[in-house]
Interface confidence: medium
């Protein structure tokens, strides 16, 4: 009776920076009673960890038994459907889940205007599950690169884009008025991590005076 | 001296593409910003984007909307406009210009920012 339930069809992780969440897609027509086995394997140590014996929902987030994500050779996981005393085969992640799977996020964007200067500042994520010592900087101690994307409404342009190479950056507003709406991608040179575009913060320009909203 | 001269336009039916490019006969312009503007029959000129001398920031007009690239290549002094999912309302000459300085600056939204001229070419689309 232990292979009657269909496999969930997929299992991938989406992690962004100490935010590992493992996702998967539902077995058809499941019921009521239906809910989903986790297990995780560390590369090195070849052996499979139950996470999560019946998890009802198709996410677990497996930041706190990940957290050595960034100084390992990765991790493998595997889920499987169970109903009662039936279950499922396991479905297992199609790639290693190691630091190259991590999206690249920002904390925030800070703006300030300075003598015709837009003026950024990049704060780099700082998530509650990391531990002390494992700063953004210091595991991506090097090339650190990001994209500014800038809009300004209403405007005779729709964005600049710059790559910079360090946490602030400055525009020259050149006499130019109106608001100015800022996006950040961060992206590390030596690496092949995905990035994701920043929320939106904008800040005010005015001949007078300036204000700054989000 | 800085002498630009574009070429690549023609006819082009909506939702093609062209590719233009601006080749730069005298100094080098590696230097300097350089960009596209362009000019609608009966219309003023009009910034279309424009790209930093190490290619790190771009800029483009708010109709581009994701359609066009901008991209030079200093080794060749040739400065390239893609322009994709081209519609009526593109046809217009296209002139690539070059002006001095490296300042991340709005300035460069501005045909008075840039000293050196090409003399254009037609983009007509047209079905």
């Known amino acids: 009776h232990g292979t009657e339930l269909p496999s969930p069809p997929s299992v991938w992780f989406e992690a962004e920076f100490f935010h590992h969440i493992l996702h998967w897609t539902p077995i058809p027509n499941q019921s009521e009673s239906t809910c989903y086995e986790v297990a995780l394997l560390r590369y090195g140590i070849e052996s499979w960890n139950s996470i999560s014996n019946c998890s009802q929902t198709l996410s677990y987030d497996l930041t706190a038994v990940t957290l050595d994500l960034y100084h390992s050779n990765g991790y493998r996981a595997r889920v499987r459907a169970v109903d009662g005393s039936r279950h499922s085969n396991w479905t297992v992640t199609n790639t290693r889940f190691s630091v190259d799977e991590v999206t690249l996020t920002v904390g925030s964007v800070n703006l300030e205007i300075h003598n015709g200067f837009i003026l950024g500042k990049i704060q780099l994520p700082r998530p509650k599950m990391a531990p002390a010592n494992d700063t953004y900087e210091s595991i991506f101690s090097h090339f650190r690169e990001y994209e500014i994307a800038i809009r300004k409404v209403p405007g005779n342009f729709t964005f600049t884009h710059k790559k910079v190479k360090h946490e602030n950056f400055s525009l020259l507003t050149s006499g130019e008025v109106g608001e100015f709406c800022v996006q950040v991608k961060p992206s590390v040179a030596s690496r092949s991590n995905k990035g994701m575009w920043s929320k939106e913060e904008c800040i005010s320009l005015t001949r007078q005076y300036f204000t700054v909203t989000n | 001296e800085v002498q630009l001269l574009e070429s690549g336009g023609g006819l082009v039916q909506p939702g093609g593409s062209l590719r233009l490019s601006c080749a730069n006969s005298?100094?080098?312009?590696?230097?300097?910003?350089v960009g596209w503007f362009r000019q609608a029959p009966g219309k003023g000129r009009e910034f279309v984007s424009a790209?930093?001398?190490?290619?790190?920031?771009?800029y483009f007009g708010d109709f581009v909307e994701g359609r066009f690239t901008i991209s030079r290549d200093n080794s060749k002094n040739t400065l390239y406009l893609q322009m994709n999912s081209l519609r009526a309302e593109d046809t217009a000459v296209y002139y690539c210009?070059?002006?001095?300085?490296?300042?991340?600056?709005?300035?460069?939204?501005?045909?008075?920012?840039?000293?050196?001229w090409g003399q254009g070419t037609l983009v007509t689309v047209s079905s």
């Open positions: 790209i930093t001398w190490n290619g790190d920031t771009t």
């Open positions: 005298g100094r080098t312009f590696s230097s300097h910003t």
């Open positions: 210009a070059a002006a001095t300085g490296q300042v991340w600056s709005l300035q460069y939204l501005r045909e008075s920012s840039y000293a050196y």
